[in-house]
């Protein structure tokens, strides 16, 4: 049983007017624009902002008042700002969705320090791992290091999106007052969906007498 609860001031069950809802899509797969309505007799129009109307043909694009618009075979042409519109009592209501085709490409991963790293005991270690990806890619960056069990490191992350062709993700590992137990292999691992890359560096600790 599906129950509609009619609300003339709210034609869509979920309203995304200020911040669009993001929908991840895969080309060739079904894409649902979930602008289900509070009453089955509300007429809804699907637009690719601002100029294109996507007309339900009963085959590739189907309207279902309980689900929204179902696009059976999504293409790159459905990437963008899709808006469901309904006019109720002379008022135009809109709910917005951003369709987003995510990629999982990792272009490059680097640790921006000399290899191997030579450090005096008691000093601070700073390792900067940089991952470069296409614009529509997100990554998870993790570190493994010798005294990981004691959570010796603090990690800061940031994204640089000022490049017009790529995203650059930074993960900066810092360990204060380096001890002998901190020497060894430091690995930065970068994952994006099924894609994976890693880079490592060796850290050597010295007493002043050996420098």
């Amino acid at each position: 049983i599906y129950i509609f609860i009619s609300d003339t001031g709210r034609p869509f069950v979920e309203m995304y007017s200020e911040i669009p809802e993001i929908i991840h899509m895969t080309e060739g797969r079904e894409l649902v624009i979930p602008c289900r309505v509070t009453s089955p007799n509300i007429t809804v129009t699907l637009k690719k902002f601002p100029l294109d109307t996507l007309i339900p043909d009963g085959k590739r694009i189907i309207w279902d008042s309980r689900k929204g618009f179902i696009i059976s075979n999504a293409t790159y042409k459905e990437i963008g700002l899709l808006t469901c519109e309904a006019t109720v009592n002379g008022h135009l209501y809109k709910t917005n969705y951003l369709t987003h085709r995510q990629t999982n490409t990792i272009i490059d991963v680097q640790i921006s320090t000399p290899r191997p790293v030579k450090l005096l005991r008691g000093h601070t270690l700073v390792l900067n791992c940089t991952a470069t990806t296409p614009l529509n890619t997100r990554v998870q960056m993790t570190w493994s290091y010798p005294d990981e069990k004691n959570k010796r490191a603090s990690v800061r992350r940031r994204i640089d999106q000022s490049n017009s062709h790529a995203n650059i993700f930074y993960s900066v590992l810092t360990i204060d007052k380096m001890q002998n137990k901190d020497k060894g292999l430091y690995t930065c691992r970068v994952r994006s969906g099924p894609s994976f890359k890693s880079v490592n560096t060796s850290v050597h600790i010295y007493d002043k007498a050996f420098i």
Epitope: S17, E18, P20, F49, P50, L51, D52, T53, Y76, K77, I79, G80, L81, L92, K94, N96, L98
Partner: antibody, heavy 119, light 110 residues
Framework: EVQLLESGGGSVQPGGSLRLSCTAS????????MNWVRQAPGKGLDWVSS?????????YHVDSVKGRFTISRDNSKNTLYLQMNSLRAEDTAIYYC???????????WGQGTTVTVSS | QSVLTQPPSASGTPGQRVTISCSGS????????VNWYQQIPGTAPKLLIY???QRPSGVPDRFSGSKSGTSASLAISGLQSDDEADYYC???????????FGGGTKLTVL
């Protein structure tokens, strides 16, 4: 590199006609809505016309040019057009061709072509 | 007379933060998203902010946008001399079936 290159501007007497062209390169032209925006000397930006990606019935014009200007496109030539008839002095401006962004707004602008209507 | 209303001018010193406002109505800003454009004299406009607050790649995070009801604003922090330009807000208008712009705000870096 994504580029829009306008041409066809010039000087014309009131009542005359001009046809502006905008050639696109560096992107799949047929996948994007396109627009014309103008800027009168020393003034702000004013939207003139828009056309959807297929160039079908979805064409829009600002009221002041309706019945005089027609926007069209030829996707096989990667070209956008603006046919301007019955030109008036107030149509004097730089005309920019612009591409719609996937997610709203006009993300690519041409360098503009100047139209001067004067007797 | 522009459909969207902006102050004609704004100014600030290097390093300062300045805000430019843009007001409209339900049929444009109230029911649609806002974009901001930067136009350096003698050049074509450039998209600065889209979807109210999103920056295209290449735009520094010193630029930020916001929207509330039928008004929007553009904030520029850490003002630099090369920010001196005209700034325009824009939105789609459901009644006019077209784009509408603000009259533009001339930003001067003192």
């Amino acid at each position: 590199e994504v580029q829009l290159l306008e041409s066809g501007g010039g000087s014309v007497q009131p009542g005359g006609s001009l046809r502006l062209s905008c050639t696109a390169s560096g992107f799949n032209f047929e996948d994007y809505g396109m627009n014309w925006v103008r800027q009168a000397p020393g003034k702000g930006l004013d939207w003139v016309s828009s056309i959807n990606r297929n160039g079908d019935i979805s064409t829009y014009h600002v009221d002041s040019v309706k019945g005089r200007f027609t926007i069209s496109r030829d996707n096989s030539k990667n070209t956008l057009y603006l046919q301007m008839n019955s030109l008036r002095a107030e149509d004097t401006a730089i005309y920019y061709c612009t591409k719609n962004h996937d997610y709203h707004g006009m993300d690519v602008w041409g360098q503009g072509t100047t139209v001067t209507v004067s007797s | 007379q522009s459909v969207l209303t902006q102050p004609p001018s704004a100014s600030g010193t290097p390093g300062q933060r300045v805000t430019i406002s843009c007001s409209g109505s339900r049929s444009n800003i109230g029911n649609n998203f806002v974009n901001w454009y930067q136009q350096i004299p003698g050049t074509a406009p450039k998209l600065l902010i889209y979807l109210n607050s999103q920056r295209p790649s290449g735009v520094p995070d010193r630029f930020s946008g916001s929207k509330s009801g039928t008004s929007a604003s553009l904030a520029i922090s850490g003002l630099q001399s090369d920010d001196e330009a005209d700034y325009y807000c824009a939105s789609w208008d459901d009644s006019l079936n077209g784009w509408v712009f603000g009259g533009g705000t001339k930003l001067t870096v003192l």
